[in-house]
Interface confidence: low
């Protein structure tokens, strides 16, 4: 027989020879990190066919690391479901807890003993320090000094000293999230007031008011013979500017010369801040203009936001 078979878990006792005679026996022992459990044989014999009698290393079992219990408020998950050396133990914390220590431990051989590569980690409760204080505003639970996971605070703005109120810019509610970090940045409180939106050759059809504060929304339509260049709806943004910019009403050109532009609502690069002029007479557009009186909207003389002052 030629050299005897090699195995993952057991090794030949003595040095292998290039050839063995029929009837010659070789013995194996479990490798370092494995231990023998009877009754399976750990030897083989060279038989008449010049082959080795069947033998396997099933009698040699891997050394296993000590049992690790789940950390408090977490789980210890053995990779491949085994504690044998060469494998890993993964640690996860429950929601609202975070891991202190190694996320993965390795079952390693030290001499002939299998031990874990380190100490098991612990799961600590997620706590947040107080959320940011904001200028001109406050948040709920301002007296609480330690917040737990998913605790939420809601911001509100103080009454303003002047005639214009503070507006809350951003999300009003934040919560204590993973990694002891608040879910988002705190909002801010500031006076936001947009200028009166003037559209020449057009008129406002909704959102009437004495002043236009944060998120005030206004709609327009153009006079007969004019089309809207830009959006018919604008909103007062946090920078005290209209978004999109205040639209313009451009004169419809006669069909004989050029086709009127499509209703693209493209934003104009220049702005018009003059008072509206009276509608110029001219040919009607080839497309249907917006209706002039939207049902349900108050007439221009009914200033619906005046009551807010």
């Amino acid at each position: 027989c030629e050299e005897p078979p090699t195995f993952e878990a057991m090794e030949l006792i003595g040095k292998p020879k290039p050839y063995y005679e029929i009837g010659e026996r070789v013995d194996y022992k479990c490798k370092k990190g494995y231990f023998y459990i009877p009754p399976l044989a750990t030897h083989t014999i060279c038989d008449r066919n010049h082959t080795w009698l069947p033998v396997s290393d099933d009698a040699c079992y891997r050394e296993t690391c000590p049992y690790i219990r789940d950390p408090l408020n977490g789980q210890a998950v053995p990779a491949n479901g085994t504690y044998e050396f060469g494998y890993q133990m993964h640690f996860i914390c429950n929601e609202g807890y975070y891991l202190i220590g190694e996320e993965i431990l390795y079952c390693e051989l030290k001499g002939s003993v299998a031990i874990w590569s380190g100490k098991p980690p612990i799961c600590e409760k997620v706590l947040c320090t107080p959320p940011p204080k904001i200028k001109n505003g406050k948040h709920t639970f301002s007296e609480v000094e330690v917040f737990e996971y998913l605790d939420a605070v809601t911001y509100s703005c103080d009454p303003a000293p002047g005639p214009d109120p503070f507006s809350l810019i951003g999300e009003s509610t934040i919560y204590c999230g993973d990694n002891s970090v608040w879910s988002r940045a705190a909002p801010e409180c500031k006076v936001v007031k947009c200028r009166f939106p003037v559209v020449e050759n057009g008129k406002q059809i909704s959102g009437f008011g004495k002043k236009f504060y944060y998120k005030a929304t206004v709609m327009f339509e153009c006079d007969k013979g004019f089309y809207l260049d830009g959006s018919d709806t604008i909103v007062c943004d946090s920078n005290s500017t209209w978004d999109p910019p205040v639209p313009k009403c451009l004169k419809v050109l006669p069909p004989s010369s050029t086709k009127p532009p499509a209703l693209s609502h493209s934003v104009s690069t220049s702005s018009t801040t003059k008072s509206p002029a009276s509608s110029a007479s001219g040919p009607r557009p080839t497309y249907k203009p917006p209706v002039s009186n939207y049902p349900g909207y108050p007439k221009p003389e009914e200033g619906i936001l005046d009551s807010l002052d």
């Epitope: 204080k133 007296e143 330690v146």
Partner: antibody, heavy 118, light 107 residues
Framework: EVQLVESGGGLVQPGGSLRLSCAAS????????ISWIRQSPSRGLEWLGV???????NYNSAFMSRFTISRDDSKNTAYLQMNSLKTEDTAVYYC????????????WGQGTLVTVSS | AIQLTQSPSSLSASVGDRVTITCRAS??????LNWYLQKPGQSPQLLIY???SLHSGVPDRFSGSGSGTDFTLKISRVEAEDVGVYYC?????????FGQGTKVEIK
């Protein structure tokens, strides 16, 4: 590690005023939330107020009208201004660094004694 | 303001005894309670924060427990150096307040 040292205590007549100082060494006073706490045999330990790193303050409402906490970053010092002092304000006054943003007090100084007496 | 009531107001123990001090809050304060020890002639020192967490350098014979309104400080085997006045302190709500103190003496 920042060290806080209180000073400015002494004998004062009822109705009088006194300003206590809390000088920081080894760090900037503006980097920490600073609380004032006092202790007397009759009233025990009492938290008076706090000045936050952003300059904002919170007070114990029982002392809010008479006591003011402030800070001078250029002098690296926090202050407790006490007005309309009463005999029951006699106490040892401590300035305290709030522990890393958490209100537990791990950095007690030696305190300064204020005696209000005629 | 939230009131903290400690009991007993004073106690005398022998070295090696187990000592228990309680602190009761007038309102629910979760676990937002600290314990301090003021040794004779010294400033207070932090022992335990957040009900049961030992401050660095504090011997493990000290332990804290409780939740809500009832809290306990235990010294498993009292030593001569543990004499002084023990205070609890809440910090869930301004103003932060302290208990009236418990004086511990050694027989």
């Amino acid at each position: 590690e920042v060290q806080l040292v209180e000073s400015g205590g002494g004998l004062v007549q009822p109705g009088g005023s006194l300003r206590l100082s809390c000088a920081a060494s080894g760090g900037s006073v503006s980097s920490y939330d600073i609380s004032w706490i006092r202790q007397s045999p009759s009233r025990g330990l009492e938290w008076l107020g706090v000045i936050w790193t952003d300059g904002g303050t919170n007070y114990n409402s029982a002392f809010m009208s008479r006591f003011t906490i402030s800070r001078d970053d250029s002098k690296n010092t926090a202050y407790l201004q006490m007005n309309s002092l009463k005999t029951e304000d006699t106490a040892v006054y401590y300035c305290e660094r709030v522990y890393d943003g958490y209100p537990w007090f791990a950095y007690w100084g030696q305190g300064t004694l204020v005696t209000v007496s005629s | 303001a939230i009131q903290l009531t400690q009991s007993p107001s004073s106690l005398s123990a022998s070295v090696g005894d187990r000592v228990t001090i309680t602190c009761r809050a007038s309102q629910w304060i979760s676990n937002y309670l600290n314990w301090y020890l003021q040794k004779p002639g010294q400033s207070p020192q932090l022992l335990i924060y957040y009900t049961s967490s030992l401050h660095s350098g504090v011997p493990d014979r000290f332990s804290g427990s409780g939740s809500g309104t009832d809290f306990t400080l235990k010294i498993s085997r009292v030593e001569a150096e543990d004499v002084g006045v023990y205070y609890c302190q809440q910090y869930i709500k301004l103003p932060w307040t302290f208990g009236q103190g418990t004086k511990v003496e050694i027989k």
